[in-house]
């Protein structure tokens, strides 16, 4: 079942999917001046069996001005890139696919693809949020949103993420220096830490971590 809406928008934050559930579709979009080849796929589809998931179909773009097709890129499981409707950024740490049955990794780029990827998520998909550059999270730990089905309708859970600008640290004379972020994790947490500089979440661990004190209870 496809999710009706996009994941929630959080001020000064972007989201990423670490892996994509089977059934997810990725539009074959081309950058300005290029278009899909005739008879080319409209989208890629994450499909699989009990042991392996991969992207079906291939996206191919050709120049709008010529009839020559560009080199075909076959989707292969690869490093993480960026998420739905944001500019693609530097690769992220690969997720251990073996730990995520029924999921596809981020498809590799195809030649002349658009700068934004448009995904169509399915129920059960989880995405993770981080503050954009220049903003910092008020709370520690991954802020996540999950597409759920309730009463026959799909909805995304709301991540408890507040991203604040760093223009004011307000250290008054005599005030102690701020603590560094703890080196190790407190006993009830795992080793992942999400801040503006660290978004290398291991998906299978992140799902167990807190976002709001009570979101695990609430949601």
């Amino acid at each position: 079942e496809l999710c009706d809406d996009d994941p929630p928008e959080i001020p000064h934050a972007t989201f990423k999917a670490m892996a994509y559930k089977e059934g997810t579709m990725l539009n074959c979009e081309c950058k300005r001046g290029f278009r899909r080849i005739k008879s080319g796929s409209l989208y890629m589809l994450c499909t699989g069996n009990s042991s392996h998931s991969s992207w079906d179909n291939q996206c191919q773009c050709t120049s709008s001005a010529t009839r020559n097709t560009t080199k075909q890129v076959t989707p292969q499981p690869e490093e993480q890139k960026e998420r739905k409707t944001t500019e693609m950024q530097s690769p992220m740490q690969p997720v251990d696919q073996a730990s995520l049955p029924g999921h596809c990794r981020e498809p590799p780029p195809w030649e002349n693809e658009a700068t934004e990827r448009i995904y169509h998520f399915v129920v059960g998909q989880m995405v993770y949020y981080q503050c954009v550059q220049g903003y910092r999270a008020l709370h520690r730990g991954p802020a996540e949103s999950v597409c759920k089905m309730t009463h026959g309708k799909t909805r995304w859970t709301q991540p408890q993420l507040i991203c604040t600008g760093e223009m004011e640290t307000s250290q008054f004379p005599g005030e102690e220096k701020p603590q560094a972020s703890p080196e190790g994790r407190p006993e009830s947490e795992t080793s992942c830490l999400v801040t503006t500089t660290d978004f290398q979440i291991q998906t299978e661990m992140a799902a167990t971590m807190e976002t709001s004190i009570f979101t695990t209870e609430y949601q």
Partner: antibody
Framework: EVQLLESGGGLVQPGGSLRLSCAAS????????MHWVRQAPGKGLEWVSV????????YYADSVKGRFTISRDNSKNTLYLQMNSLRAEDTAVYYC???????WGQGTLVTVSS | QSVLTQPPSASGTPGQRVTISCTGS?????????VHWYQQLPGTAPKLLIY???ERPSGVPDRFSGSKSGTSASLAISGLRSEDEADYYC???????????FGGGTKLTVL
């Protein structure tokens, strides 16, 4: 069970100082931003200050900026509010609150009067 | 004066449905920040009633619901009970203050 317990309130003269403490338990204190919110007698809630989970940044309401200082000790699961140059209008119940704020303490009364 | 605007009072009879409005601006509710609602019973600390616009913490009856649209939000209480008599506050983060802002509170009276 989440618990937030404020202490340090009391009667102080104008211009005086107080240090409030908030002892936290029942959740991973070091993962959450913490707030001080106050409520003057018979009035509504007024946000005072917030500190990020690691203490790396703090923000203050204009009414207390330059006089109050928020801090935290994650090793002790404790939040602090140092209040200097107190004024009569600072008289209120001071609550510490965690997260959204999701949870609140029961509050400690600060009375500024001569 | 509070940054978020609420009616100072509201009332209803048992079993009735009442709504409390909360109006903000482009730096808080209108900026996309979530709205939270708190219930404060006489002589007690505020308690989170609704978070993230329309989510209920466990233990909060489904008689309480929230919604948000544009720069405003509302809290609805259906099947009003005498124990609902309390002060209700809305709150949202404000990016110009870098902190949460509260409504002035609405005193709900069950007639």
């Amino acid at each position: 069970e989440v618990q937030l317990l404020e202490s340090g309130g009391g009667l102080v003269q104008p211009g005086g100082s107080l240090r409030l403490s908030c002892a936290a338990s029942g959740f991973t204190f070091s993962s959450y931003g913490m707030h001080w919110v106050r409520q003057a007698p018979g009035k509504g809630l007024e946000w005072v200050s917030v500190i990020s989970y690691d203490g790396s940044y703090k923000y203050y309401a204009d009414s207390v900026k330059g006089r109050f200082t928020i801090s935290r000790d994650n090793s002790k699961n404790t939040l602090y509010l140092q209040m200097n140059s107190l004024r009569a209008e600072d008289t209120a119940v001071y609550y510490c609150a965690a997260g959204v704020p999701d949870y609140w303490g029961q509050g400690t009364l600060v009375t500024v009067s001569s | 004066q509070s940054v978020l605007t609420q009616p100072p009072s509201a009332s209803g009879t048992p079993g009735q449905r009442v709504t409390i409005s909360c109006t903000g601006s482009s730096s808080n509710i209108g900026a996309g920040y979530d709205v939270h609602w708190y219930q404060q019973l006489p002589g007690t600390a505020p308690k989170l009633l609704i978070y993230s616009n329309n989510e209920r913490p466990s233990g909060v009856p489904d008689r309480f619901s929230g919604s948000k649209s544009g720069t405003s939000a509302s809290l609805a209480i259906s099947g009003l009970r005498s124990e609902d008599e309390a002060d209700y506050y809305c709150a949202a983060w404000d990016n110009s203050l870098n902190g949460p802002v509260f409504g002035g509170g609405t005193k709900l009276t069950v007639l």
